[in-house]
Interface confidence: low
């Protein structure tokens, strides 16, 4: 029959070539001479010439040796043909498969391969895999199948098995208890792959096993007693810088420290933070200390770490002294901001109010008193007695210097220690109304028609407060009232003004007397423009000219 | 990564004040304090003062005492340093730096030029 | 204040040349001394903190020591990136003070 079966050809073949493998037959060679080709990948197209078949005789040759690991499968076809050229069989499938021989090592995928554990684990846990390849076959024989094993370790302690590798998968784990950082911080293995299963060739790799810190170091302190000297007051002062030793990763969670005020601190004057690159602890004031009160502190503080600690170890504690040194303080006004309530416009001389300061300090030291920031220069402070007067007119009108009623001052109290020290207090007068401001019209000056005038609408305004202001009351006075007539609106506090019979083009003087609800009484001047127009005005126009 | 990054040069007039602003990226800002730096054309460091970035107390160099103020603003990680009544000889690179005691990070410098 | 001292003002050497910096602190600051290396129109960088430890990213070459009143920075191998100046500083007391600064050129 015109088939051939697979056809299996060892990779590597010493020869001789041509080698033949097979014989291609078409039992149509009784009939008339068959001639005989192959074709596909291998024959006559790439790679071209591997194959070729002996054309009267069907013989399938071989004309180099072949590499599994090229090409592991050939599919070629064979054909027949007559004299005459005409087919006399359909195209044959003839497959080649190239069988392996054990002509490749194994090969790691790194020359070093890292891999880390942390330092006390239990035998069993695994720490890292290594990979080797083979590019033999390891499906249909050993010759890629790769065993491991660890050919060595270094350093032995704290004895030369402390690592097991699966024979078949690379994984490496721990097999003893005993893994200690500070002792060992870093493993050498020799690691080998061998193909056959372990009974061919062999290649070597490094597998570096870092042992990652645990833990299981307490950071001490070193020295244990501190004693420090801290100024009364300062604020974020560095009292002292704390210094601890932890055998532990230097800058890792595990070494880091982490320092707590655990007692003598009642006040919460203290804070203490770690130094992020000397580890140490920068013990400063979160408050001012206060010498009067307390002058010497004993701190204890003690440190743990970032990361908790693995097993249970002592926890250090470290004793810091803190003398409080006296620093002259400055008076202190009680309160520090006085409201006083005062009439405006009280005379010269009066009292306003007494206003003193406290010294924090031990000493019986002497106060003097004088004002800092008198923007109007309204007042007076006795330097002894701390007695505020009045030296000026107070204005509660006065836009200048009062805000919303009230006129702010600043005195001075200063000791006599050495060197002198200085407080500060305020004192706020709350200026309470007079009625010393009578009702003002605007605007002062209006344009107005002769013929059918509109009114003109004045806004009164008071500078006063409630009850010096509003109902207002008008009246002309001065003759005014013969030719005009004022009302007062007490909706919105305006008064309209009218005229009341004709007067010629010209600028008049209405005298307007307002006073306000606790009579005070203000005269005001308008000056009115009277025009020749009918109604509306804003400006007189030009008078007509003839032609 | 910490970043320090200062303000543009600055040319003033003798007499004058210049603001100089260190802007702070990449750690914790308030734990630290920042020192500022100078250094005159051709010159070697010469330290100014420094402030804690949380508290905002300072300590300035007596050379500097009464001219200079160094202020924080928390908000947008910021640390300023004023200088007034400027003179030539302020003519320098003004540099931010971290640190408690000695500097890890410095800014890149704000060259600050007084000239009539 | 407390004056820094270094010497030399400046120094030549060549590639692969150990090349030592002195300081000397006018009175105690223990080992409360850093380096700093300066190239020209840079930033200073700092080397050295605690008189004798490398900041992280520093390469070996560079290794400082003393304590006391007398310090020292060695550059053992110079390397073309190392030409600069470099500035001594005492953090011991304020204020803080530097050095008058080396410059490390080519020879």
């Known amino acids: 029959d015109w088939v051939v079966a697979p056809i299996s050809v060892p990779e590597n073949g010493k020869g001789p070539f041509p080698q033949r493998l097979n014989q291609l037959k078409s039992n149509k060679d009784r009939d008339t001479k068959i001639f005989y080709s192959i074709t596909g990948p291998g024959a006559d197209s790439p790679p071209e010439g591997v194959f070729a078949v002996e054309k009267e005789t069907g013989w399938l040759l071989l004309n180099k040796p072949l590499d599994r690991e090229e090409i592991a499968k050939y599919e070629l076809f064979g054909h027949a043909v007559s004299e005459n050229g005409a087919s006399v069989e359909d195209p044959m499938n003839i497959s080649i498969i190239v069988t392996d021989q054990n002509d490749h090592k194994p090969k790691f995928t790194q020359d070093t391969f890292r891999g880390s554990v942390l330092e006390g684990v239990l035998p069993g846990t695994s720490v890292m895999q290594v990979t080797a390849t083979d590019e033999d076959d390891a499906i249909h024989t050993y010759n890629g199948v790769v065993a491991y094993s660890i050919h060595s370790q270094e350093p032995k302690d704290p004895h030369d098995l402390m690592f097991t590798i699966h024979r078949s998968t690379g994984t490496i784990s721990v097999i003893s208890s005993g893994l200690d950082r500070e002792k060992v911080p870093e493993y050498t293995l020799t690691i080998q792959a061998t193909d056959m299963d372990g009974d061919g060739s062999t290649t070597t790799a490094v597998a570096v096993v870092e042992i990652l810190d645990a833990n299981d170091n307490a950071p001490v302190f070193d020295p244990q007693k501190y004693e420090s000297h801290v100024p009364e007051n300062a604020v974020g002062h560095e009292v002292q810088r704390l210094t601890v030793t932890d055998l532990d990763a230097p800058n890792s969670p595990a070494w880091r420290a982490t320092y707590l005020i655990v007692g003598g601190d009642d006040g919460d004057h203290f804070t203490i933070a770690t130094h992020p690159e000397s580890n140490q602890g920068i013990l400063t004031t979160r408050k001012g200390l206060d010498f009067e009160a307390k002058n010497q502190h004993t701190l204890y503080v003690e440190v743990t770490n970032e990361a908790p600690f693995v097993l249970k170890l002592p926890t250090s504690t470290a004793t810091i002294v803190v003398h409080v040194e006296d620093v002259n303080e400055a008076p202190v006004f009680v309160p520090p901001s006085k409201v006083v309530e005062v009439q405006e416009g009280i005379p010269t001389g009066e009292a306003v109010c007494v206003y003193t300061a406290k010294d924090p300090d031990k000493e019986n030291q002497k106060i003097s008193y004088r004002i800092l920031r008198d923007p109007a220069g309204w007042l007076a402070m006795d330097p002894d007695s701390g007695q505020v007067t009045v030296a000026g007119t107070l204005d509660r009108e006065d836009e200048r210097f009062v805000r919303n009623n009230i006129y702010e001052v600043m005195v001075l109290a200063v000791d006599n220690g050495s060197p002198p020290t200085t407080g500060t207090g305020t004192l706020l007068l709350t200026l309470i109304d007079v009625n010393d401001h009578g009702p003002v019209p605007e605007p002062r000056e209006i344009t107005i028609c002769n013929q059918s005038p509109e009114s003109q609408v004045l806004n009164i305004t008071d500078k006063d407060l409630s009850p010096h202001t509003s109902p207002f009351q008008a009246q002309l006075t001065d003759d005014s009232d013969i030719y005009w007539m004022a009302e007062v609106n007490e909706k919105d506090d305006t008064v309209v003004l009218s005229l009341k019979k004709f007067l010629k083009q010209d600028t008049y003087d209405v005298h307007l007397s307002l006073s306000d609800h606790g009579n005070k009484e203000q005269l005001t001047v308008i000056r009115a423009t009277v025009c020749d127009c009918h109604g509306h005005v804003e400006k007189c126009p030009d008078p007509w000219k003839g032609g | 990564q910490v970043q320090l990054v200062q303000s543009g040069a600055e040319v003033k007039k003798p007499g004058a004040s210049v603001k100089v602003s260190c802007k702070a990226s990449?750690?914790?800002?308030?734990?630290?304090?920042m020192h500022w730096v100078r250094q005159a054309p051709g010159q070697g460091l010469e330290w100014i003062g420094n402030?804690?970035?949380?508290?905002?107390?300072?300590n300035y160099a007596q050379k500097f005492q009464g001219r200079v103020t160094l202020t924080v603003d928390k908000s947008s990680s910021t640390a300023y340093m004023e200088l007034s009544s400027l003179r030539s000889e302020d003519t320098a690179v003004y540099y931010c730096?971290?640190?408690?005691?000695?500097?890890?990070?410095w800014g890149q410098g704000t060259l600050v030029t007084v000239s009539s | 204040d407390i004056q820094m001292t270094q010497s030399p003002s400046s120094l030549s050497a060549s590639v692969g040349d150990r090349v030592t910096i002195t300081c000397k602190a006018s009175?105690?600051?223990?080992?409360?001394v850093s380096w700093y290396q300066q190239k020209p129109g840079k930033a200073p960088k700092s080397l050295i903190y605690?008189?004798?430890n490398r900041f992280t990213g520093v390469p070996s070459r560079f290794s400082g020591s003393g304590s006391g009143t007398d310090f020292t920075l060695t550059i053992s191998s110079l390397q073309p990136e190392d030409f600069a100046t470099y500035f001594c500083?005492?953090?011991?007391?304020?204020?803080?003070?530097f050095g008058q600064g080396t410059k490390v050129e080519i020879k």
């Open positions: 402030i804690q970035l949380s508290y905002g107390n300072t």
């Open positions: 990449g750690f914790t800002f308030t734990s630290y304090w």
């Open positions: 605690w008189a004798s």
């Open positions: 730096a971290r640190g408690f005691s000695y500097f890890d990070y």
């Open positions: 500083e005492q953090y011991s007391s304020y204020p803080f003070t």
């Open positions: 009175q105690n600051v223990d080992t409360d």
